[in-house]
């Protein structure tokens, strides 16, 4: 593919909707970056069509995507990580939509990832524990996280807890005795940096234990 | 109407240090990048330091990295230059800087004057 369209082709394709979003990865591998874009409809007719991000960047002035499937990617260490870059649609030469945007601001966390639940039965509760990879990171490294929990015959009664710490305490009393649940966690960047929820953590399952009948407590 | 004042700047001694101030008025200073830029008698201006709207993020030049510190407080809208050991080459205008675009700077103090003597 030439990546260059027919005059026929120009045409109709300023009829198309080429809005797109993208997010950033900052030390995602090494002190390496990425940014992943997208197009909102996922019907667009993507032949021939390419990204270019220009400006804010260090020694170039320009970088291209590359296309793997749907999505527009880019991993490199010349983000400057100050100001905006703009990043435009483009077939051939021409600029078919273009936004203004400071790679900072849109920002979408590693998974957590490790996640695990201990009972404690002499505390009558959970230990939930997690890690992420952000500890180690120089830029993005203060994360809220959300840990979503749900019985799991409950499909989509999920309760949230929001912490800043990779550890969080689940009384017994607050859970259903004998029961199934799924837990999740996810981050996002808070101070510094702003964006976007990352990808779930792989789900961690545990059961309760049951009721003491004589005592009225859970085993 | 002015939207970028510096100030801080003076005669100083070889070896010497100096902390420049820009306050700016223009209400999108929380989200804007900012930095200073310098221009010496005779000579084009060069870059010298710029950081990101949180100030998580910064970045100098060769010719100061290690002497010189940028800063900014966003609830003061004040961006700073903490310029240690300075050399008589460091002489000239320095001008602060706003809303870095695409590589283009959106708006411009009137700068303040730096001379380091030997």
């Known amino acids: 593919e030439s990546g260059y369209a027919q005059n026929g082709d120009l045409e109709d394709a300023e009829l198309d909707d080429y809005s797109f979003s993208c997010y950033s990865q900052l030390e995602v591998n090494g002190s390496q970056h990425s940014l992943t874009c997208a197009f909102e409809d996922p019907d667009v007719n993507t032949t021939n069509l390419e990204f270019e991000i220009c400006g804010a960047l260090v020694e170039v002035k320009c970088l291209n995507f590359r296309k793997l499937q749907e999505i527009y990617f880019i991993e490199t260490k010349k983000f400057l990580l100050i100001g905006k870059s703009n990043i435009c649609v483009k077939v051939g030469e021409k600029s078919l939509t273009c936004k203004k945007i400071d790679l900072t601001t849109i920002v979408k966390p590693e998974a957590p990832f490790d996640l695990s639940v201990i009972y404690r039965e002499g505390a009558n509760d959970f230990v939930v524990t997690f890690n992420t990879s952000h500890l180690q990171k120089k830029y993005v490294k203060v994360l809220m996280h959300d840990v979503a929990y749900r019985q799991e015959k409950d499909e989509n009664k999920w309760t949230h807890v929001n912490l800043s710490s990779t550890k969080l305490t689940l009384l017994q009393r607050k859970l259903q005795p004998a029961a199934m649940y799924e837990i999740k966690v996810r981050s996002i960047p808070d101070h510094y940096f702003k964006g976007f929820w990352s990808e779930w953590s792989p789900s961690y399952y545990f059961r309760t234990p049951e009721i003491n009948n004589s005592s009225g407590e859970m085993d | 109407e002015v939207q970028l004042v510096e100030s801080g700047g003076g005669l100083v001694q070889a070896g010497g240090s100096l902390r420049l101030s820009c306050e700016s008025s223009?209400?999108?200073?929380?989200?804007?990048?900012m930095g200073w830029v310098r221009q010496a008698p005779g000579k084009e201006r060069e870059f010298l330091a710029a950081i990101g709207w949180s100030g998580a993020v910064t970045h100098y030049s060769d010719s100061v990295q290690g002497r010189f510190t940028i800063s900014r407080d966003n609830a003061k809208n004040t961006v700073y230059l903490q310029m240690n050991s300075l050399k008589s080459e460091d002489t000239g205008r320095y001008y602060c800087a706003e809303d870095y675009d695409t590589d283009v700077w959106q708006y411009w103090g009137q700068g303040t004057q730096v001379t380091v003597s030997s």
């Open positions: 223009i209400s999108t200073f929380s989200s804007d990048a």
